[in-house]
Amino acid sequence: DFGLDCDEHSTESRCCRYPLTVDFEAFGWDWIIAPKRYKANYCSGECEFVFLQKYPHTHLVHQANPRGSAGPCCTPTKMSPINMLYFNGKEQIIYGKIPAMVVDRCGCS
Amino acid sequence: DFGLDCDEHSTESRCCRYPLTVDFEAFGWDWIIAPKRYKANYCSGECEFVFLQKYPHTHLVHQANPRGSAGPCCTPTKMSPINMLYFNGKEQIIYGKIPAMVVDRCGCS
C-alpha cells in the first residue's frame, strides 16, 4: 500500500495527497477549544485504470462494467484520528479522539 | 452509519449501493478455482454536500475549499472479505480470506 504525496508546486495530475491546514478559527467554529488548526490534508487527482487502486474490487467492477458505474475516484485510503477538546451540545467540555480527521494516504476506489 | 441500497429499477440519483455479481468464469480468470462467481456490489450516484458523508474530514475539506479538491465521490465506506481458493504465481493452490471484495455500504468521501 502506497500513495503519492504532492504539494502546491507539483505538476502531478494523478491521484495524490496534498497538504491542507484546517483552521477552525477561520471557520468560526468556536466550540472547538483545541486544536485551533491542524494538518488535515486532502486527496485530488485523476484515477487512471489500475493506478493506486486500493481494492481488487475496484478492478473487478471495472471489468464487469455495470450500468452507471463511474470508475474509481481519488479518495482517502488511510486516515488517522486527532485528539480534540470541544464543547458538546450540553456545553460540557469533552476531550476525545476523533476518528478519520487526517488523510495519511490517497488512492483510487 | 448507513447507506442507501438500490437496484436496477431505482430512480435514486444519490450515492447508492447497487447489486453486482462478479463472474470470474466470464472474465476467463480460471486461476480462481472458487468461487466462480460472487456478489460484489458497487457504488454509484451523486454526492450532494453533506449527503452520506462518512468522515467529518470531508466536510472540513469542503469548508476549506483548497485548489483542485473535487468534492466527495460515491465510494465504498464498508467492505467485507470473501474466502477464495486460487492458484498463486508458483501454481500452488492457496486458500485465503481476500479483504475488501464485497461492498457492504456506500457513502460520500
Epitope: - | 470470474f24 468464469e25 480460471d30 486461476w31 480462481i32 478455482i33 472458487a34 468461487p35 466462480k36 474466502n83 481458493l85 492458484f87 501454481e91 493452490i93 486458500y95
Partner: antibody
Framework: QVQLVQSGAEVKKPGASVKVSCKAS????????MHWVRQAPGQGLEWIGN????????NYNQRFKARATLTVDKSTSTAYMELRSLRSDDTAVYYC?????????????????WGQGTLVTVSS | DIQMTQSPSSLSASVGDRVTITCKAS??????LSWFQQKPGKAPKTLIY???RLVDGVPSKFSGSGSGTDYTLTISSLQPEDFATYYC?????????FGQGTKLEIK
C-alpha cells in the same frame, strides 16, 4: 447441460499403453478439476488422480504415478488419461468425473458429473 | 493413505425397511466424506457430501451423519430403485480413498 463423454472400449496386450479420452461440454472446461477413477470387474472404486485444465496442475495416487499421465487439450475441452505398461490387473472401467466446489473451505468438493466409463481389457 | 472400512459388505433388506451403512476411517477426516450409489453398468452417483449434505435432486430418504472417523448413511424407507451398491469416499487428503462398497440386495 454439463456432460462428459468418454471414448470407446479398448482391448490391449500386456505391456502396451492405453489413452482414454473424456470430452467435456456445457461448462467452462478449464476452470474445474477433472478426476479419474477406475473400477476393476466386480471390485470397488480406486482414485487415479486429478488435473486442473487451466494450468495442467495435477495430483496422482502414488500407486499410479509411475505409469499414469493426465493431460488436457483445452482447444477441444478434452481430458486424457494414459496408462502405460499395462498388466492384466489393469482391466477395469475407467471413469472421468468433474469435481464441483460447493463451499467456503479448502476441501469443499464433490463429484457432480461422471463420464459413462470406458472399459479397458488387458489380455494376451 | 487413509483406509476406509465399510460395513456390512452386503445387506439383504425388504421394501419399506430402514437400513444403515457405516464407514470408518483410519484417521479423522474432518467430515470430508461423500456417499455414492452405483447400479450395475452405470457410473456412481453422489448422494451425500460433507458427511450430511444432500445433493440437489436426491430424495430426502437418504441421510448422512457422523464426524471424526465414524460415518453413517441411512435410507429411511427402501424402494425397489434403491437396491444397488453404495460406496463412501474420504476427500480430506490425497490420495482420495473409497470404502470397499456395500451391496444392498432385495430379501
Amino acid at each position: 447441460q454439463v456432460q462428459l463423454v468418454q471414448s470407446g472400449a479398448e482391448v490391449k496386450k500386456p505391456g502396451a499403453s492405453v489413452k482414454v479420452s473424456c470430452k467435456a461440454s456445457g461448462y467452462s472446461f478449464t476452470g474445474y478439476f477433472m478426476h479419474w477413477v477406475r473400477q476393476a470387474p466386480g471390485q470397488g472404486l480406486e482414485w487415479i488422480g486429478n488435473i486442473y485444465p487451466y494450468n495442467s496442475v495435477s495430483n496422482y495416487n502414488q500407486r499410479f504415478k509411475a505409469r499414469a499421465t493426465l493431460t488436457v487439450d483445452k482447444s477441444t475441452s478434452t481430458a486424457y488419461m494414459e496408462l502405460r505398461s499395462l498388466r492384466s490387473d489393469d482391466t477395469a472401467v475407467y471413469y472421468c468425473a468433474r469435481r464441483y466446489y460447493y463451499g467456503t473451505g479448502p476441501a469443499d468438493w464433490y463429484y457432480d458429473v461422471w463420464g459413462q466409463g470406458t472399459l479397458v481389457t488387458v489380455s494376451s | 493413505d487413509i483406509q476406509m472400512t465399510q460395513s456390512p459388505s452386503s445387506l439383504s433388506a425388504s421394501v419399506g425397511d430402514r437400513v444403515t451403512i457405516t464407514c470408518k476411517a483410519s484417521q479423522d477426516i474432518n467430515s470430508y466424506l461423500s456417499w455414492f450409489q452405483q447400479k450395475p453398468g452405470k457410473a456412481p452417483k453422489t448422494l451425500i457430501y460433507r458427511a450430511n449434505r444432500l445433493v440437489d435432486g436426491v430424495p430426502s430418504k437418504f441421510s448422512g451423519s457422523g464426524s471424526g472417523t465414524d460415518y453413517t448413511l441411512t435410507i429411511s424407507s427402501l424402494q425397489p430403485e434403491d437396491f444397488a451398491t453404495y460406496y463412501c469416499l474420504q476427500s480430506d487428503e490425497f490420495p482420495l480413498t473409497f470404502g470397499q462398497g456395500t451391496k444392498l440386495e432385495i430379501k
